[in-house]
């Protein structure tokens, strides 16, 4: 969490941003909130990016003002206009790309004063893993697949029964570059699995951590998966 204040005491307002991650090929949100004003026409929101000459986005007098917008962001940005009055200056970014990563500044002017806060925005790819029993294998084998990751993640297997066990010797992980030549498909195979046990395939990079669980019994197979972003730090 980054909390920024205006420069001159009495005329400063609090602006809060949250470091976040964008999944390339999706829309992303850069979070920013501020002390609200009672008049929308008195609020100015400017988003800037370090190293970029033009503005990322500007909203003033109740509407978008994009004449100074940098070409890199043309047609891609929006604020939530109906939520500005309650102090939401968050930015929506269409079709996030790797090049969108960097340091952004959310700069606010209201009738109460000015304030700004920086935000670290990471970009990469992350997806939910799916764990299945590999019936083609000669022994009981599990196959964990996740379609898109970047940067290259680590893959670790764990088991409920053998807690703390190191499965690196009985697993094999491969990374296959996807057609757009950025993201990669992750495939990890775990050999010699035992029945009546729950296995977890954990995929992690510096942006996200995802886990796929599978419980194999004589009568059924149960699966579940979840994903969490790692760098949601507020400023």
């Amino acid at each position: 969490l980054i909390i920024g204040f205006g420069i001159s005491g009495r005329h400063s307002i609090t602006v809060t941003t949250v470091a976040s991650a964008g999944n390339i090929g999706e829309d992303g949100i850069l979070s920013c909130t501020f002390e609200p004003d009672i008049k929308l026409s008195d609020i100015v929101i400017q988003w800037l990016k370090e190293g970029v000459l033009g503005l990322v986005h500007e909203f003033k007098e109740g509407k978008d003002e994009l004449s100074e917008q940098d070409e890199m962001f043309r047609g891609r940005t929006a604020v939530f206009a109906d939520q500005v009055i309650v102090g939401n200056a968050s930015l929506r970014l269409k079709n996030v790309q790797l090049t969108d990563a960097g340091t952004y500044k959310c700069y606010i002017i209201t009738s109460k004063g000015k304030g700004n806060a920086n935000l670290e925005y990471k970009t990469g790819a992350f997806s939910m893993p799916e764990v299945n029993v590999d019936y083609n294998a000669s022994s009981e084998t599990l196959r964990c697949e996740a379609p898109r990751w970047f940067p290259q993640p680590t893959v670790v297997w764990a088991s409920q029964v053998d807690q703390g066990a190191n499965f690196s010797e009985v697993s094999n992980t491969s990374f296959e570059l996807n057609s757009e030549n950025v993201t990669m498909k992750v495939v990890s195979v775990l050999y010699n699995v035992t029945i009546n046990n729950t296995y977890s395939c954990m995929i992690e990079n510096d942006i996200a951590k995802a886990t796929g669980d599978i419980k194999v019994t004589e009568s059924e197979i149960k699966r579940r998966s979840h994903l969490q972003l790692l760098n949601s730090k507020a400023s």
Epitope: L66, G75, A78, S127, E180
Partner: antibody, heavy 116, light 109 residues
Framework: EVQLVESGGGLIQPGGSLRLSCAAS????????MNWVRQAPGKGLEWVSV???????DCADSVKGRFTISRDNSKNTLYLQMNSLRAEDTAVYYC??????????WGQGTTVTVSS | EIVLTQSPGTLSLSPGERATLSCRAS???????LAWYQQKPGQAPRLLIY???SRATGIPDRFSGSGSGTDFTLTISRLEPEDFAVYYC??????????FGQGTKLEIK
């Protein structure tokens, strides 16, 4: 040259299925938001479905549960699987690339007629 | 659900005249996500304006877009014979993800 070419349209009975294809050249499908948009005879444009660069998909309520958008990255091709077709699905179907600057590349369209 | 309402439904003008087409949204739309398209009979739509006011590649400068919030305008400063067509506005980002207006037919008077 940046181009989209649709195929797969035709005459189909109500309740039937059809798969439309859209072959892309000059750009990579999986780096863009790719859409299907349709136009019923004498009517306006109606958005049908999108597949994001990430592979996630979304579609209009009118086709939810019946139509599925997909892509084959190795063939650089977009698809629309249409099941449980109805008379009101009769239209020209366009595939369109939504680049950063709006739907800037369109195919020529393929006609789907649902009739008994 | 965002509804885009275009007016007039039909606009009858002569070559050389100025055309003003309106697109009104039922709730606020980001300027970045508002586009205009031209469609001629038997052809696919063609992108004219994106980001409410930026001309797409190859579009003549007689076409201009303006507006913000809920009111957007497409202006053709001096009509050429090839400009007579149907024009659609379109938004991105709300539910449904993409919405088109019903269209304005620009016909020769």
């Amino acid at each position: 040259e940046v181009q989209l070419v649709e195929s797969g349209g035709g005459l189909i009975q109500p309740g039937g299925s059809l798969r439309l294809s859209c072959a892309a050249s000059g750009f990579i499908v999986s780096r863009n938001y790719m859409n299907w948009v349709r136009q019923a005879p004498g009517k306006g444009l109606e958005w049908v479905s999108v597949i994001y660069g990430s592979g996630r998909t979304d579609c209009a309520d009118s086709v939810k549960g019946r139509f599925t958008i997909s892509r084959d990255n190795s063939k650089n091709t977009l698809y629309l699987q249409m099941n449980s077709l109805r008379a009101e699905d009769t239209a020209v179907y366009y595939c369109a690339r939504d680049g950063d600057y709006g739907m800037d590349v369109w195919g020529q369209g393929t006609t789907v007629t649902v009739s008994s | 659900e965002i509804v885009l309402t275009q007016s007039p439904g039909t606009l009858s003008l002569s070559p050389g005249e100025r055309a003003t087409l309106s697109c009104r949204a039922s709730q606020s739309v980001s300027s970045s996500y508002l586009a205009w398209y031209q469609q001629k009979p038997g052809q696919a739509p063609r992108l004219l304006i994106y980001g409410a006011s930026s001309r797409a590649t190859g579009i003549p400068d007689r076409f201009s877009g303006s507006g913000s919030g809920t009111d957007f305008t497409l202006t053709i400063s001096r009509l050429e014979p090839e400009d007579f067509a149907v024009y659609y506005c379109q938004q991105y980002g709300s539910s449904p993800l993409y919405t088109f207006g019903q269209g304005t037919k620009l016909e020769i008077k």
